[in-house]
């Protein structure tokens, strides 16, 4: 068997290995060895048993989408049967104290490797043996401790495979330099060991995205509005706009980034390096937010220009790619892939990323303050209760709504919040009354709302001992 | 809807040089390889080369290598062969076709150039 | 380079007959084999991709099949618009080739 037959549904073509070559893995026109890695169809009884009390679960995962010429990394975790786990010698042990459907296990080890490994591996001193290999025949790479590793994961994506040797979790990383934008498939198979050969007790699948596109999203924060995912903002207040480039294996680390920003509001173009930018919109109605982003990334060097034609044709290169980051040699020969590639050769590509929005902004709140605080008479009977009045100005529309919030000193451990809805006019002058227990001081926090919008403001207010002889305290 | 546009015929002379356009629509342009196609007249199909929108990754058959150049410019969304030194063995019509990914097979094509070499 | 063959330069039919049309490929190119119609005056137009896939909108007339190095096209009741000239590709590598097509005429 190749590697094609056993990990996925289709032989791929030549021309899809060539045009997409990934640095350090092998073609899936490599034999597979079957006797040391069976393999099994779907649906075959033989899954049941693959694995002590129950079936094993891979779960695959990665970072993409990838900017083309960026690192893409994919994990598979392992995901064990109730009360399992990996020790740390690499055994599978049952968790202290876990029930599971056969209730609590006599023997700690779900699979004892390292016993085996101790007792029956018979070696010829090189710590090589015929059986500690991949399925192609390659030895298992003799790191420290990688006896403790007894989970085999082979990758593959675009007619070629990639092996690892490792434990319940596992990273790959994979250079997208030469990789055909758009979606491809990355399939996983996980082997364990078992005596002298493997047993196969996962297969997982996911599709990954390599784009020419910056991944870009832009988050939006303006104070008072009440809903920051709506895209709804209010007016005469600045917006925000927090620009997240998803790089997560830093490729554009030592690219200057520009951004440029139109806001649908003719303010025109504003072009800026800074990834956060404040706009405010005085106006009220839709508004297209259109962002582009530009990079200058590391990219293939554009081809020479042909030479002037010589009167006796001389052989030249079929494909002409210099890659910033590699120095394998590529097929070599009369392969009509030939790669060409110049060390010292640095070159850059713009990339751009784009981002679009309809912004809508309608009034709101924009301010809210407090003018004034009075104490108000209270009858003796409630010697331990205060009244006050707060006299609150806003600006901006008419609010429906007044909560106030009153808590410790610290405005960490919230006492009492009292919402009601509230009749205001034009003017947007308004009386809060509120009632504190007893003396201190207090945080209050009083807020504004309507539809849109939610305006805040805090004060600190001291609460003075009651005198019963005196019924009446002066405002503050 | 993908359209591939090309120009309806060139006619040009021995020894000069034509830059025949394809330009794309409806699809992403980098996200897939353009190739070119000669097909002399009352003959068969002939693949040229084709090229990466994306980064500008090029693949020739051997014989055309000294006589095809392809380029692209993203801007435009427009794919180019030039072709020189130009003999009547060139006369033929020239079609560009997008691939589906990595599959080098042909879903969208051009309508053609005919080239007219003559003196 | 991958050579393919296709044996018959002319193949006469009636309409409604059953016709198949081979290619033989130099070297196993499984399953990577294209089937396409070009009328006179057209563009080539793609019917079938890795050798048995009929593509979106191809009448199920038209039906591909084969492996290793010999592959069949089949139009199951042939139509008066079915008259064109049909090549083979291999799309299995680089460089792409194509058959030397053929013509289907009416007898």
């Known amino acids: 068997k190749r590697f094609h037959d056993v990990l996925g549904n289709e032989r791929p073509s030549a021309y899809m290995r060539e045009h997409n070559q990934l640095n350090g893995w092998s073609s899936d026109e490599n034999d597979w060895n079957e006797k040391l890695y069976p393999v099994w169809k779907r649906g075959d009884m033989r899954w049941k048993n693959s694995w002590k009390g129950g079936r094993v679960q891979a779960v695959l995962t990665s970072d993409s989408p990838a900017l083309v010429g960026s690192n893409i990394t994919f994990a598979v975790n392992l995901i064990f049967p109730r009360c399992q786990k990996e020790d740390a010698n690499g055994n599978i042990v049952y968790e202290k104290n876990c029930r599971n459907e056969a209730g609590l296990s006599a023997d700690p080890y779900v699979y004892n490797w390292t016993a085996w490994s101790e007792d029956s591996d018979g070696e010829n001193g090189t710590g090589q043996s015929h059986h500690n290999v991949f399925p192609d025949g390659k030895p298992f790479p003799h790191h420290p401790g990688w006896r403790r590793w007894n989970f085999i994961y082979v990758f593959h994506t675009l007619g070629q495979y990639f092996q690892k040797l490792g434990r319940c979790s596992v990273r790959v990383s994979v250079n997208t330099a030469n990789v055909t934008l758009g979606p491809q498939l990355m399939e996983v198979t996980v082997y364990r060991r078992h005596g002298r050969a493997y047993v196969p007790i996962a297969q997982v699948k996911d599709v990954y995205v390599v784009t020419d596109q910056i991944p870009v999203f832009v988050t939006m924060f303006q104070k008072n509005d009440r809903n920051s995912s709506d895209e709804t903002f209010l007016k005469d207040l600045p917006i925000m706009f927090d620009v997240l480039i998803h790089d997560p294996s830093h490729f554009l680390n030592y690219s200057t980034i520009n951004y440029k920003w139109s806001f649908g509001d003719n303010t025109g173009l504003f072009v800026s390096t800074n990834h956060t930018v404040n706009h405010t919109y005085v106006l009220n109605g839709t508004f297209s937010l259109n962002l582009t982003v530009k990079a200058a990334a590391p990219g293939p060097c554009p081809p020479p220009p042909p030479p002037p034609r010589p009167s006796k044709p001389t052989p030249s290169l079929a494909t002409t790619l210099k890659s910033y980051d590699s120095n394998t040699p590529g097929p070599a020969g009369d392969n009509p892939l030939e790669l060409s590639r110049i060390p010292d050769e640095n070159c850059q590509i713009n990339r751009y990323g784009h981002f679009q929005a309809t912004i809508t902004i309608v009034e709101g709140i924009l301010e809210v303050n407090i003018i004034q605080m009075t104490d108000v008479l209270m009858p003796v009977p409630w010697p331990e209760s205060s009244l006050i009045d707060f006299v609150v100005t806003c600006q901006g529309s008419i609010p429906t709504e007044v909560c106030t919030i009153i808590s410790d000193p610290t405005c960490e451990i919230t006492q009492n919040t009292v919402c009601s809805p509230v009749d205001v006019d034009e003017m947007c002058l308004l009386t809060v009354r509120r009632t504190f227990n007893g003396s201190g001081t207090y945080c209050v926090n009083l807020t504004l709302g309507d539809d849109t919008s939610l305006a805040l403001t805090s004060t600190l207010i001291s609460v003075p001992d009651r005198d019963p002889a005196s019924p009446l305290r002066m405002a503050n | 809807q993908v359209q591939l546009q090309q120009p309806g015929a060139e006619l040009v002379k021995p020894g000069a040089s034509v830059k025949l356009s394809c330009r794309a629509s409806g699809y992403t342009f980098t996200s897939y390889w353009l190739h070119w196609v000669k097909q002399r007249p009352g003959q068969g199909l002939e693949w040229i080369g084709e090229i990466n929108p994306s980064d500008g990754r090029t693949n020739y058959i051997e014989k055309v290598k000294t006589k095809a150049t392809l380029t692209v410019d993203k801007s435009s969304s427009t794919a180019y062969m030039q072709l020189s030194s130009l003999t009547s063995e060139d006369s033929a019509v020239y079609y560009c076709a997008r691939s589906g990914g990595n599959y080098a097979w042909f879903a969208y094509w051009g309508q053609g150039t005919l080239v007219t070499v003559s003196a | 380079d991958i050579v393919m063959t296709q044996s018959h330069k002319f193949m006469s039919t009636s309409v409604g007959d059953r016709v198949s049309i081979t290619c033989k490929a130099s070297?196993?190119?499984?399953?990577?084999v294209a089937w396409y119609q070009q009328r006179p005056g057209q563009s080539p137009k793609l019917l079938i991709y890795?050798?048995?896939y009929r593509y979106t909108g191809v009448p199920d007339r038209f039906t591909g099949s084969g492996s290793g190095t010999d592959f069949t096209f089949t139009i199951s009741s042939v139509q008066a618009e079915d008259l064109a000239v049909y090549y083979c590709?291999?799309?299995?590598?680089?460089?792409?080739?194509f058959g030397a097509g053929t013509k289907l005429e009416l007898k």
């Open positions: 590709q291999q799309h299995y590598s680089i460089p792409l080739t």
């Open positions: 070297q196993d190119v499984s399953p990577s």
């Open positions: 890795s050798a048995s």
